[in-house]
Interface confidence: medium
């Protein structure tokens, strides 16, 4: 599949305030009940290997993870937070449906595999790993697709 | 055996109200998110309203915001639906399913249990 | 809201032979999407989730295929009990599912 532009968010995504708070305390209530403070998820291993232009469609394969396997199963947590930032999550991911890459994805699928493993191995303080960092997916997705 | 079973439906006058329950077993219901669909007489399906394993999230369809309500009561394995200020539209099959959930295996992802229904008519 | 149309909406199928069903999204819902079957009176049943993995107790003729915004579904050669209403659903907007009008099913 061609390289094409759906790999792409609109700035105003990022640009509205209320969201962008739920989002950030969302991040900080999680992170306050994380205790493994010697892993990080998202951070420059994450990217290694990994040109810029593809970088938002590695950034979509985070998000589609978060979403799935952590924010979904844990939804009852961190209200009133979670209710409000998972559709708005839930939005960015259908506005990255179409995003592809062409030629060899194998570093990105190995990057998000290691992270997915990573946060299976945590098992649920894991997950609430994956949660504390969500002011960083919301960051890198910025960084990546705008 | 993995079951869903409503109850409660009935005739109401527009603006009445009405609360319907579904009581489940076989399952451990306080592990899985539960949904009400709605289906009108010769229609389709039509979400309704979905509540997070614990109660601690819900989220309602547009059309029913602020008049339908759904909770659970996990010591008793049921589900409802309240039903305030009914109107003619609101005439249908309210069906509730096992939606969202974690077992040991996988994340469950779909409406894969339903009950048999219970039928609101909403008609002066 | 995602918008669901499924396609046509009264199919006419010999018993035994192949009947295809198909559903598009008015945007991209991945992979994300359920196929039921509703017999009258009775309840939906799951029978396809994720686009292509069977539910349990789907029999193997059913199968499930598309991506994005176009899907199928297939029923390789009809039984009698196949005969029935057939809906789509997204879970990609979660938790804002929409179904599609469905289709109708019916012995040719």
């Known amino acids: 599949l061609p390289v094409n532009t759906r790999c792409k968010l609109e700035v105003s995504n990022f640009q509205q305030p209320y969201i962008v708070n739920r989002t950030f305390m969302l991040a900080k209530e999680a992170s306050l009940a994380d205790n493994n403070t010697d892993v990080r998820l998202i951070g420059e291993k994450l990217f290694r290997g990994v040109s810029a232009k593809d970088q938002c469609y590695l950034m979509k394969q985070v998000l589609n993870f978060t979403l799935e396997d952590v924010l979904l199963p844990q939804s009852d947590r961190f209200q009133p937070y979670m209710q409000e930032v998972v559709p708005f999550l839930t939005k960015l991911s259908n506005q990255l449906s179409s995003c592809h890459i062409s030629g060899d994805d194998q570093n990105i699928q190995k990057n998000v595999r290691r992270l997915k493993e990573t946060v299976k191995k945590l098992g649920e303080s894991g997950e609430i790993k994956a949660i504390g960092e969500l002011d960083l997916l919301f960051m890198s997705l910025r960084n990546a697709c705008v | 055996e993995v079951q869903l079973l409503e109850s409660g439906g009935g005739l109401v006058q527009p603006g009445g109200s009405l609360r319907l329950s579904c009581a489940a077993s076989?399952?451990?219901?306080?592990?899985?998110?539960m949904s009400w669909v709605r289906q009108a007489p010769g229609k389709g399906l039509e979400w309704v309203s979905t509540i997070t394993s614990s109660g601690g999230a819900t989220y309602h369809a547009d059309s029913v915001k602020g008049r339908l309500t759904i909770s659970r009561d996990n010591s008793k394995n049921t589900l409802y639906l309240e039903m305030n200020s009914l109107r003619v539209e609101d005439t249908a099959v309210y069906y509730c399913a096992k939606d969202w959930g974690r077992t040991v295996y996988a994340v469950i992802k779909d409406l894969d249990i339903w009950g048999q229904g219970t039928l609101v008519t909403v008609s002066s | 809201e995602i918008v669901m149309t499924q396609s046509p909406a009264i199919l006419s199928v010999s018993p035994g032979e192949r009947a295809t069903l198909s559903c598009r999204a008015s945007q991209s819902v991945s992979n994300y999407l359920a196929w039921f079957q509703q017999k009258p009176g009775q309840a939906p049943r799951l029978l396809i989730y994720?686009?292509?993995k069977r539910a349990t107790g789907t029999p193997a003729r059913f199968s499930g295929s598309g991506s994005g915004t176009d899907f199928t579904l297939t029923i390789s050669s009809l039984e009698p009990e196949d005969f029935a209403v057939y809906f789509c659903q997204q879970r990609s907007d979660w938790p804002q599912y929409t179904f599609g009008q469905g289709t109708k099913l019916e012995i040719k």
């Open positions: 076989g399952f451990t219901f306080s592990t899985y998110a």
């Open positions: 994720d686009t292509s």
